[in-house]
């Protein structure tokens, strides 16, 4: 239903849009897991921490982020039926003081300590790919999605309309 | 276009209640979240309390155990029921919503003209 090409007619803009203000419009705490169901959880390993996609035992207990939600400052007003709203940017911090960075160079998603104002690589724009299912798309690269890859997260280039709705770029959030 | 409309605002005592409702209308296809914000002359806008799409809420510290957010995914309709109401919540109310449309999965923030909540004897 969403070719590509409408995808970077809303964020061919990313690379130079700015966040307004420097405080969030909301936050709240969710897991967050693939489409598949599998979680994803954070551990600390050697003073650094560590992204894993992982079937969790039953009763086990899921790992929280904390999701921001900031506003970009120009209004996305390109859209065919006159949508006035200012498009959404993430960022998700599993603990505090670190923050989900997408590095770019490498294809990787990491965990950095920081601090704020945050750097461009931790703001993903948030899409609504598929029912209950949410997508993660880079500020610094638009058509690169955070996505599943042998068990890891990595950003992965999304180049076709049918590679939008792909299991490995959607997640579920959830507050339970 | 997205709309949000506001209502039930007004002027209640100190300790009374108030509920406020706010309806969302357009061509939405997916609402990730709806909450409230509030601006008090001569401050910057606030969150109250926001509720997402999994039912998950969460609330301004001066709020809690006073202020309660509801939802209805049926109609787009997101609900604030406000007890034990103080001067200090004397302030604009804004509805605010987080959607994608029929025509793009961009999530986008929009938000209501506000409605005005006084407390005062």
């Known amino acids: 239903a969403f070719g590509i090409s409408g995808v970077q007619k809303y964020t061919r803009a990313l690379h130079d849009s700015s966040i307004t203000g420097i405080s969030p419009i909301t936050e709240y705490l969710a897991s967050l897991s693939t489409y598949n169901d599998q979680s994803i959880t954070f551990a600390l390993e050697d003073e650094s921490y560590e992204i894993y996609v992982e079937d969790l035992k039953k009763d086990e207990k899921k790992d929280k982020v904390l999701l921001s939600y900031y506003e970009s400052q120009h209004p996305s007003n390109e859209s065919g039926d006159g949508v006035d709203g200012k498009m959404l940017m993430v960022t998700l911090s599993p603990t505090k003081d670190f923050w989900l960075h997408a590095n770019n160079k490498e294809h990787s998603v990491e965990l950095h300590k920081c601090e704020k104002p945050l750097p461009d690589q931790a703001f993903f724009v948030l899409h609504n790919m598929h029912s209950n299912c949410v997508s993660f798309e880079c500020k610094t690269d638009p058509g690169v999605f955070i996505g599943v890859k042998d068990n890891h997260l990595a950003l992965i280039k999304v180049d076709s309309s049918e590679n939008l709705c792909t299991e490995n770029i959607l997640f579920k959030l959830s507050e339970t | 276009e997205v709309q949000l409309v506001e209502s039930g605002g007004g002027l209640v005592q100190p300790g009374g209640s108030l509920r406020l409702s706010c309806a969302a209308s357009?061509?939405?296809?997916?609402?990730?979240?709806m909450g409230w914000h509030r601006q008090a002359p001569g401050k910057q806008r606030e969150l109250v309390a926001v509720?997402?799409?999994?039912?998950?809420?969460n609330y301004a510290d001066s709020v809690k155990g006073r202020f309660t957010i509801s939802r209805d995914d049926t109609k787009n309709t997101v609900y604030l029921q406000m007890n034990s109401l103080r001067a200090e919540d004397t302030a604009v109310y804004y509805c605010?919503?987080?959607?994608?449309?029929?025509?793009?999965?961009?999530?986008?923030?929009?938000w209501g003209q506000g409605t005005l909540v006084t407390v005062s004897s």
């Open positions: 605010n919503a987080a959607a994608s449309t029929y025509s793009s999965t961009v999530v986008r923030s929009f």
């Open positions: 357009g061509s939405i296809r997916t609402v990730n979240y």
């Open positions: 509720v997402t799409s999994g039912g998950g809420t």
